[in-house]
Interface confidence: low
C-alpha cells in the first residue's frame, strides 16, 4: 500500500481551523491478524529523509494522536487529551485519515507528517508516510479562509520501515 497526500501545502489565516488529509491507497489486507496504526506528527525539512524526525503537535506526541484499527475501518481520537489541545485525528471507511487543528496560531506553521504502520501479529511492519506544509498567516495579506495546493505527485514517497 501507499499513502497519498492530496494537498502538499495549506495556507490558512490565524484563528481558522484546518483539516490535513492523507489517503491510504492500494491493496489493503483485511486479514484478522492485520491492523493499521495511523498517526500524525511534526517534522522538519532539510533532513536526509523527510519525516524521520518526530516532533509533537501542540505538545502531543505521535503516540497520543494514534488511531488503531483494521484496514478501512472508521475511527477517531476520542480522548480528551487531544481535544483539549484543539486536535482530532480521524479515519473513514475509504482509507482517508486526517488531523483537524482548531484555532490556528502562527506557531502551528511547519511540516506535518502522517504515518501508517501495518502490524501483522508481532511487528513485521510495513510503514509509509506522507508530508505536507502548513503556513499560518496573519495581517492584511492573510487569506480569509484556508487555501490548499494540490500535490504535484499524489503519491508520497513510499517508505518501508522508516
Amino acid at each position: 500500500f501507499k499513502v497519498a497526500t492530496p494537498y502538499s501545502l495549506y495556507v490558512c489565516p490565524e484563528g481558522q481551523n484546518v483539516t490535513l488529509t492523507c489517503r491510504l491507497l492500494g491493496p489493503v489486507d483485511k486479514g484478522h491478524d492485520v491492523t493499521f496504526y495511523k498517526t500524525w506528527y511534526r517534522s522538519s525539512r532539510g533532513e536526509v529523509q523527510t519525516c524521520s524526525e518526530r516532533r509533537p503537535i501542540r505538545n502531543l506526541t505521535f503516540q497520543d494522536l494514534h488511531l488503531h484499527h483494521g484496514g478501512h475501518q472508521a475511527a477517531n481520537t476520542s480522548h480528551d487529551l487531544a481535544q483539549r489541545h484543539g486536535l482530532e485525528s480521524a479515519s473513514d471507511h475509504h482509507g482517508n485519515f486526517s488531523i483537524t487543528m482548531r484555532n490556528l496560531t502562527l506557531l502551528d506553521s511547519g511540516l506535518y507528517c502522517c504515518l501508517v504502520v501495518e502490524i501483522r501479529h508481532h511487528h513485521s511492519e510495513h510503514r509509509v508516510h506522507g508530508a505536507m506544509e502548513l503556513q499560518v498567516q496573519t495581517g492584511k495579506d492573510a487569506p480569509s479562509n484556508c487555501v490548499v495546493y494540490p500535490s504535484s505527485s499524489q503519491d508520497s514517497e513510499n517508505i518501508t520501515a522508516a
Partner: antibody
Framework: EVQLQQSGPELEKPGASVKISCKAS????????MNWVKQNNGKSLEWIGN????????TYNQKFKGKATLTVDKSSSTAYMQLKSLTSEDSAVYYC?????????????WGAGTTVTVSS | DVVMTQTPLSLPVSLGDQASISCRSS???????????LHWYLQKPGQSPKLLIY???NRFSGVPDRFSGSGSGTDFTLKISRVEAEDLGVYFC?????????FGGGTKLEIK
C-alpha cells in the same frame, strides 16, 4: 511528563500469588505496547511479555507462560502483571516499560520497578 | 531463544577515554522486513534502564552524540567517544527481532 508509576514492594510466601500494577500517565495509554521485564540481583534482564492495551492482545516469553498473566484496565490507564505459584526464583525487581514505537521492542519509558520477595 | 553475549563483563576506563562494548547474537538479527532490531540501554545504580540506541545506530532523543552504535547481522558495537562520569553504569544490548526479546548479560563501565 510521561510516567509509569509502579506499585510498592511485595513480600509473599511460597505458593502465593501477587498482582503488581503500572499506572501510565502523560500519554495515550493505548498508543504503545506495555512490556514487563524481570531483573535478578541487579544484573540480568529477562523479557516476560507484552500487552497491546488497545486490543488486550498478549505475547509471552514461553518461559513465563503459566507464571505471569498480563492484563490492562483502559479506563484507569493501568497495566497489571499477576505472578502465581511463587517460589524463591521469582524474587526479583519487575519493571513495566513502554514500547516507544508501538510494537517494535525498544522501550523509552520504564517504571521505577517493583521488588517482589518470596520468603517463608 | 536468541542468546546475546556481551564483552567485556567489566570495562575500567579513565574519564575522557574511548570505550567500546561488543554484543554478539546467536543468530542473525535481520528481520524479514529488512530491519535489525538491536538496541542499547544504560542502567545507572539504583535506577531503571534508559534507552540509548535503537535499531543498531539510531540515538534516542536526548542521548549525547558521543554515543554511537554500529554493526550488522550478529555482531554489534556500542562506542562512547569520550567517557564522562555520568556514563558510568551497566550497559545492556537487547534484540527484538525474535520473540522472546532477549538481553545481553551487561557490561559494567567503571572508573579505572
Amino acid at each position: 511528563e510521561v510516567q509509569l508509576q509502579q506499585s510498592g514492594p511485595e513480600l509473599e510466601k511460597p505458593g502465593a500469588s501477587v498482582k503488581i500494577s503500572c499506572k501510565a500517565s502523560g500519554y495515550s495509554f493505548t498508543g504503545s505496547n506495555m512490556n514487563w521485564v524481570k531483573q535478578n540481583n541487579g544484573k540480568s534482564l529477562e523479557w516476560i511479555g507484552n500487552i497491546d492495551p488497545y486490543y488486550g492482545y498478549t505475547t509471552y516469553n514461553q518461559k513465563f507462560k503459566g507464571k505471569a498473566t498480563l492484563t490492562v484496565d483502559k479506563s484507569s490507564s493501568t497495566a497489571y502483571m499477576q505472578l502465581k505459584s511463587l517460589t524463591s526464583e521469582d524474587s526479583a525487581v519487575y519493571y513495566c516499560a513502554r514500547d516507544y514505537d508501538y510494537a517494535l521492542g525498544y522501550f523509552d519509558v520504564w517504571g521505577a520497578g517493583t521488588t517482589v520477595t518470596v520468603s517463608s | 531463544d536468541v542468546v546475546m553475549t556481551q564483552t567485556p563483563l567489566s570495562l575500567p576506563v579513565s574519564l575522557g577515554d574511548q570505550a567500546s562494548i561488543s554484543c554478539r547474537s546467536s543468530q542473525s538479527l535481520v528481520h524479514s522486513n529488512g530491519n535489525t532490531y538491536l538496541h542499547w540501554y544504560l542502567q545507572k545504580p539504583g535506577q531503571s534502564p534508559k534507552l540509548l540506541i535503537y535499531k543498531v545506530s539510531n540515538r534516542f532523543s536526548g542521548v549525547p552524540d558521543r554515543f554511537s552504535g554500529s554493526g550488522s547481522g550478529t555482531d554489534f558495537t556500542l562506542k562512547i567517544s569520550r567517557v564522562e562520569a555520568e556514563d558510568l553504569g551497566v550497559y545492556f544490548c537487547s534484540q527484538s527481532t525474535h520473540v522472546p526479546y532477549t538481553f545481553g548479560g551487561g557490561t559494567k563501565l567503571e572508573i579505572k
